[in-house]
Amino acid sequence: GSERTCCPVNWVEHERSCYWFSRSGKAWADADNYCRLEDAHLVVVTSWEEQKFVQHHIGPVNTWMGLHDQNGPWKWVDGTDYETGFKNWRPEQPDDWYGHGLGGGEDCAHFTDDGRWNDDVCQRPYRWVCETELDKASQEPPLL
């Protein structure tokens, strides 16, 4: 596979990762697919320092991250352990609120206007952040 040594055009480098900040909104699944097609993933926040970096770039705008509980437990899209990892939920969140009237609960996590996290309906068209790690060999599958 090929190894990425510098960030693509329009991406921001920080602590050996590259970040891309959308300027318009998509549903969580579409944002997730968008990042995957860029050989990246929705941002996975692993520290307070990374939280502050992302928060600085997105401003006070609802923005999807790579955290969801659509299959039961909360999971980060890159496999980072949720239980032992960094968390920054708003008080009393996540609450899987059903009162929005859109059907179902709330299964996708986003940064709120103050940067703290909330769970919300995955279909809402929020901005999103993609992340990819530098020096990570991107595996090209063998041709059949």
Epitope: N10, R23, D30, N33, R36, L37, E38, P125
Partner: antibody, heavy 121, light 108 residues
């Protein structure tokens, strides 16, 4: 010059297989997601499949899922579409198209000239 | 999937005419709407990105507008080389991108 050149089309019987190729030049092939889009005779455009720049992530239209496989060889700057269990409704011109994204845009900015696939007995 | 509906499906116009093609999405797609031009026997060519941004090299007589579900492609003064089929495409849902059925612009 940025260019995409498809090949591999032809006449095949229902249930048969075919592999299409798309040779790319004039841009850093491995940096871009690539697509197959088809157009049945006299009809509109239908997105078929996409593959990320590294080849790690692939997606398919429901109409071809489980029958078609997209792949790429970045060392050869070539995109492929393996088509199995072909049906009459797969008859179309198949185009490869480069995906272009920026802070605001998400579109297909470069297209090939197409290769015709006819599925008939 | 999001359905894209273009109107009209065909139109006849003369050189110099102002031509308007509309595209309606079955749900809100924000401004994720692209326009393509296709001539017989050729692959499509992108004209407009994201509702209103002109692709490099595309003449300024082409313009796009709209938001949400309703979009418009306008050719301010039709030229002989503009006789072709035009397609809209939504890129809101990734990657199940969908196209309109096309609008054929013919010579009157």
């Amino acid at each position: 010059e940025v260019q995409l050149l498809e090949s591999g089309g032809g006449l095949v019987q229902p249930g048969g297989s075919l592999r299409l190729s798309c040779a790319a030049s004039g841009f850093t092939f491995s940096s871009y997601a690539m697509n197959w889009v088809r157009q049945a005779p006299g009809k509109g455009l239908e997105w078929v499949s996409v593959i990320s720049g590294s080849g790690s992530n692939t997606y398919y239209a429901d109409s071809v899922k489980g029958r078609f496989t997209i792949s790429r060889d970045n060392s050869k700057n070539t995109l492929y579409l393996q088509m199995n269990s072909l049906r009459a409704e797969d008859t179309a011109v198949y185009y490869c198209a480069k995906r272009y994204t920026s802070d605001w845009h998400d579109a297909f900015d470069i297209w090939g000239q197409g290769t015709m696939v006819t599925v008939s007995s | 999937d999001i359905q894209m509906t273009q109107s009209p499906s065909s139109l006849s116009a003369s050189v110099g005419d102002r031509v308007t093609i509309t595209c309606r999405a079955s749900q809100n797609i924000n401004n994720y709407l692209n326009w393509y031009q296709q001539k017989p026997g050729k692959g499509p060519k992108v004209l407009i990105f994201t509702t209103s941004s002109l692709q490099s090299g595309v003449p300024s007589r082409f313009s796009g507008s709209g938001s949400g579900t309703d979009f418009t492609l306008t050719i301010s003064s039709l030229q002989p080389e503009d006789f072709a089929t035009y397609y809209c495409q939504q890129s809101y849902t990734t990657p199940t991108w969908t196209f309109g059925q096309g609008t054929k612009v013919e010579i009157k």
